[in-house]
Amino acid sequence: NQDLPVIKCVLINHKNNDSSVGKSSSYPMVSESPEDLGCALRPQSSGTVYEAAAVEVDVSASITLQVLVDAPGNISCLWVFKHSSLNCQPHFDLQNRGVVSMVILKMTETQAGEYLLFIQSEATNYTILFTVSIRNTLLYTLRRPYFRKMENQDALVCISESVPEPIVEWVLCDSQGESCKEESPAVVKKEEKVLHELFGTDIRCCARNELGRECTRLFTIDLNQTPQTTLPQLFLKVGEPLWIRCKAVHVNHGFGLTWELENKALEEGNYFEMSTYSTNRTMIRILFAFVSSVARNDTGYYTCSSSKHPSQSALVTIVEKGFINATNSSEDYEIDQYEEFCFSVRFKAYPQIRCTWTFSRKSFPCEQKGLDNGYSISKFCNHKHQPGEYIFHAENDDAQFTKMFTLNIRRKPQVLAEASASQASCFSDGYPLPSWTWKKCSDKSPNCTEEITEGVWNRKANRKVFGQWVSSSTLNMSEAIKGFLVKCCAYNSLGTSCETILLNSPGPFPFIQDNIS
């Protein structure tokens, strides 16, 4: 084959910052680094046809298909998509390579297909083919991992039946409480499905794919720890596997562990024991209770007993369907402008929820923390003292839950004014909602003390902006006040603000702000 230009085809994926649509080269986006698409000469094709690897992108994604041509001289080009010709403007980069780009903003089904780029250089003509399709994420799933015992081995296998196949990792911690947070140095991660070291304090298995990350903790009763004030509770759905680990440490090997369900010993095949010596020569024993697929009659108090430790129990509750228990009544809060405050929702749920906090159509990440009493709590503190409606939404595989909050920020009114030929209006967003007075400024009343009561129309909370109430007051023009300056004042328990308007002009004049407190 004759000497051909060196062709490089790349994909640039953009993180959308806004909702602009259309093909453009100046776009308000943050770009990821270019990804090589392995452009290669298609064998046995008529003419010189380069083909890039097929590209599969998410719906609404924004991408750039780009070709870099290392060929001498100028190039001209033409894009063809679905038999339509599209404008093509090559430019040259710092390495003097010809650069041709096709920007696809907010990918839709209609923009999927074959993009052909015809390039003419001084030496030769060639075609570059890109195939762009929309990824079918409807088939994607991410399921919470569960445990199985490895055949003929004292080890646990972590399984997550998800699409695409997830990366499975064990998250291990040998400390207590706060120091077992995900990014703590005490936490060790092992990217494998099988775990042999089952003696640790805190053992979790996590699965992650394009949809996110789901984790399951190995439920543990530690006989050396002081029991919780409330009995630990474990929820499972019918058919799910049950795993409870009982752990005990003693100065020597002279002790044993047993499991009972409602005072009856567990059947053989529903438990297995492991033991090891720790660094200080004490003996650690663990005894697993497991049921490969639970039924309703597996509900009850599971008690782990030791010949050398006080026994401890856990309540296992088998449910037909998942649930989210919390009070969904809406809550209103009134706080000062600099007061520290967090919204919080306390709930009990199984399976674990996914949740979001929403304000002004913006979603915020939602963190949840387990409490000792079997409840969980989610707090939201990032409101930046913006008044309005805040929504907590939670869901799991079987249930949904929404709770509304209203946040009011106590502050002195601030007044905005506008005037038309027939009326003057003032607006204020202070809280508590202000009351209004209108005053006329004249020779008789240079300090604007003459109150106007005729033609005033107050509308409390006429505009609800994402839950933020705005109060307004309108003064209808009459001959008695035409040509005069009038002053509208909004006042509440925190102070007063006023705005002065000249009534024969179409706009406010001048914006004299009298901050009378």
Partner: antibody, heavy 124, light 108 residues
Framework: QVTLKESGPTLVKPTETLTLTCTFS??????????VSWIRQPPGKALEWLAH???????SFSTALESRLTISTDTSKSQMVLTMTNVDPVDTATYYC????????????????WGQGTLVTVSS | EIVMTQSPGTLSLSPGERATLSCRTS???????IAWYQQRPGQAPRLLIY???TRATGIPDRFSGSGSGTDFTLTISRLEPEDFAVYYC?????????FGGGTKLEIK
Amino acid sequence: QVTLKESGPTLVKPTETLTLTCTFSGFSLRYARMGVSWIRQPPGKALEWLAHISSNDEKSFSTALESRLTISTDTSKSQMVLTMTNVDPVDTATYYCARMPGDSNTWRGFFDYWGQGTLVTVSS
Amino acid sequence: EIVMTQSPGTLSLSPGERATLSCRTSQTVTNSYIAWYQQRPGQAPRLLIYGTSTRATGIPDRFSGSGSGTDFTLTISRLEPEDFAVYYCQKYGSSPLTFGGGTKLEIK
């Protein structure tokens, strides 16, 4: 620019499990229909293809080694992991990962970029 | 499973000469899906040719590939000092992917 880099233990004992990681950059399996393969080369011998994984998570394995191999990717981290169970001294080789710019059952099933390789010795 | 046989095992030539390397397959290869790689000592293989005859990016035109069915050839028209290395053919298009045993091209 496209790069691939293999990492893993240099010495493994017989019967143990070997885990190798290939970290790649300059391309991704998240958007483009491509794949990454593991290929090995015993000292002084020929190349032997072991396993392949493509962006749509399709996997294929060498017939002789299928029962001992697993392959997985983490597209977010641009990594691919190969595990080989029950290793034997005959598994001593330089292990390469290489990019395939398309699917293995198409005209794009060759390897256009290779890592520099990592030598794994299996010995007690 | 297709078996790839490369011959000769070793080829001794001088710079400037023409090298012809052969690759035979035990069955017909779909659509001539054959690739050739060069491996210099202590380095990873490098793609030279794909689709039997298409040169990869940056490969000099002294390298050419030909063939069909079960017989494929890599030709180096004028050997340069840096061309002395081991060459492998590979078939693709279906699993398993297989490589030939290699031809060592050495300086005479």
